[in-house]
Structure formats: C-alpha cells, structure tokens
C-alpha cells in the first residue's frame, strides 16, 4: 500500500460574495480506512465545516460522490459565500476508531472573498 | 422488514423501451443507495445500473452504458430503470437491490437486499 | 469479472470454504446464494463480513490481501445453491463473479 497523501492542490482561491467556492482535494490511496473531514482555520479553533460521515451541511455538497469504494476525490463547493467564510480550509483524513483519529492533513487552500459585483 | 416491489416487466419488442420500477419499504430509503442487477435465462448474475441515495451520481454497465436511465424519487420511495433500443440479449429477470449503508452504485459488496424479480422478454 | 471456483462440494456438517478474486483495491465482497434458476437472489455477506439479520450465524466472510472468502461451517443439505461474488473493480463498475455451485454430499 503506498503512503496516503492529501492533495490540494489550490494554494488560494478567490470568490465573490453570494457565488460558490471550490475547494480541492484528492487523496492518492485507500488506506488507511477512515473519513475525510473538511475544517475552517487549524487548532482548537477550528470550525468544521464538511464530515463525511455526519450532516448534513446544508451549504456544502461534494463535488465526487464520497461514499464510492474507489472514490479518491473529496473536493467540495461551498455555496453563498460571505465575508465571514473567508480563511483557510483544511482537507483531512481520519482513521477510523472510536473515537476517529486524525491521521493526515492537506497544507491548506486559503479562501478570499471579493465584494459582490454591483 | 425490508421489501423491494419491482413492476414494469413483460414482453417487449426489439428497439422498443421500457420502464421497470421498484418501490423500497420497510427501511430509510433516501439513505441507502440502490442498484438493479440482472439474469438472462441459464446465466449469471450481471451489474446493470446504480444510483446514489440523493441521485445525484448515477452509474451504469458497459452493456446498457447510452440506452440506459436510472432515476429516483425519494419522497415516493422508488428508483426507475429505463431502457432504450431494446435487444434481444436484454431479456433477462430484473431485480432491484439496495445497499446496505456503504458504497453505491456499482458497489456490489455493499448489497444487503434484493427484490424478487420482474421478467422482462424482447421479442418479435 | 471477478474469479471464483466452478464448483465446491462438501459433506453434511463439514465446513466450505469459496474464494473470490479481482474485486477493485477496495478489496470488498459481497456474497450472494442462489438456490435455483430465476430465484431471487439472497445475500448471505455484505461489505466482507457483515451478515444480514436472517442469515444463520454458519455463513462468514473475511478478506485477505485482495481474496474473499465465503466460509460456510456445519454445512446442511438446505444450504445447497449457487454462489456468486460481488465487488467492483477499479474503475467503479459492478463485477459479479460467474457464480460456485455448492453440493451438498450424501
């Protein structure tokens, strides 16, 4: 099995207020088993924002479909976007436990958001 | 108890379509994904189509991959396979399956329930 | 398609076992009994080793490397059929393997 790597690939991404964003992520093996989680900022702090295993998160959709065995890609659009979802957001992947344990994160895309168009 | 009604099968005619539907009770039908499998006489069993519970992500066989539609409604509890361009080589008995809270469509190890069947015959 | 043996036979109270091979890196298997021609399908294992509630505590599946395996303990007459695989292989298609007919001796 090759070492697991997260890969997003957007160093930063720039919206404008009310569109949606794209955040990229794709993982390069299967294992370990576990979900990916999606956070806003790092530390305690931090705010999830997408779990692949509970929701649901009424303004976030996946770009693939998450529960196929083979899928690999666990990008996600955030829809409505405002000035308070600006920061950066961390793809991770969990190994499955009780509880799951964070195993691996990806270096992060930083979202700006722009004024909306007038 | 879980029970998988499918309808819509019979004789049919070469290039024709049809619409084969299974109604799902007995469990949470919007969270679970749903495939339709099929076995033409003195055959195996073969992958036809899948779905995802939201329907968002359909899939399909490499035999049916252009004539085929897989849709569902999940407020009636029902996913509906429609085929196009019939062949001769389509018939087969149809059965719908759910998976059993992993994997999708196509995702045949996931499989935990199965209809009891609709026949379907292409013929002239 | 995925591999599985023609044919496996086996004496009342003894214990089959039925391989499957070629599933996608996922390595997941599900196992399904048929005991006749144009019967329904039943599944006896889901995702591995999960068995649906109905299913006799005698049927149990496992993986290993990239094979499942079915394993049937204290085999009865009732539990002859035909036995298919299920996964999907690596680009996401559903593969069945062509099915292992189990006799029951005697």
């Known amino acids: 099995e090759e070492e697991l790597q997260i890969i997003q690939p957007d160093k930063s991404v720039s919206v404008a207020a009310g569109e949606s964003a794209i955040l990229h992520c794709t993982i390069t093996s299967l294992f370990p088993v576990g979900p990916i989680q999606w956070f806003r900022g790092a530390g305690p702090a931090r705010v999830l924002i997408y779990n692949q295993r509970q929701g649901p998160f009424p303004r976030v959709t996946t770009v693939s479909e998450t529960t196929k065995r083979e899928n690999m890609d666990f990008s996600i659009s955030i829809s409505n976007i405002t000035p308070a979802d600006a920061g950066t957001y961390y793809c991770i992947k969990f190994r499955k436990g009780s509880p799951d344990t964070e195993f691996k994160s990806g270096a992060g895309t930083e979202l700006s958001v722009r004024a909306k168009p007038s | 108890a879980v029970t998988l009604d499918e309808s819509g099968g019979g004789l049919q005619t070469p290039g024709g379509a049809l619409s084969l539907v299974c109604k799902g009770s007995g469990f949470t039908f919007s969270s679970h994904a749903m495939n339709w499998v099929r076995q033409a006489p003195g055959k195996g069993l073969e992958w036809v189509a899948g779905?995802?519970?939201?329907?968002?992500?359909?899939y399909y066989g490499a035999a049916v991959q252009g004539r085929a539609t897989i849709s569902r409604d999940n407020g009636q509890s029902t996913v509906r396979l429609q085929l196009n361009n019939l062949r001769a080589e389509d018939t087969a008995t149809y059965y719908c399956t759910k998976n059993g809270g992993c994997g999708s469509g196509g995702d045949l190890d996931c499989i935990d329930a199965w209809g009891h069947g609709t026949e379907v015959i292409v013929s002239s | 398609a995925l591999t599985q043996p023609a044919s496996v036979s086996a004496n009342p109270g003894e214990t089959v076992e039925i391989t499957c091979s070629g599933g996608g890196s996922n390595n997941a298997y599900g196992w399904f009994q048929q005991k006749s021609p144009g019967s329904a399908p039943l599944t006896v294992i889901?995702?591995?080793?999960k068995r649906p509630s109905d299913i006799p505590s005698r049927f149990s599946g496992s993986k290993s490397d990239s094979t499942g395996t079915l394993t049937i303990t204290r085999v009865q007459a009732e539990d002859e059929a035909v036995y298919y695989c299920g996964s999907a292989d690596n680009s996401g298609a559903g593969v069945f393997g062509a099915g292992t007919t189990l006799t029951v001796l005697g």
């Open positions: 779905i995802s519970s939201d329907g968002r992500f359909t």
């Open positions: 889901y995702d591995n080793g």
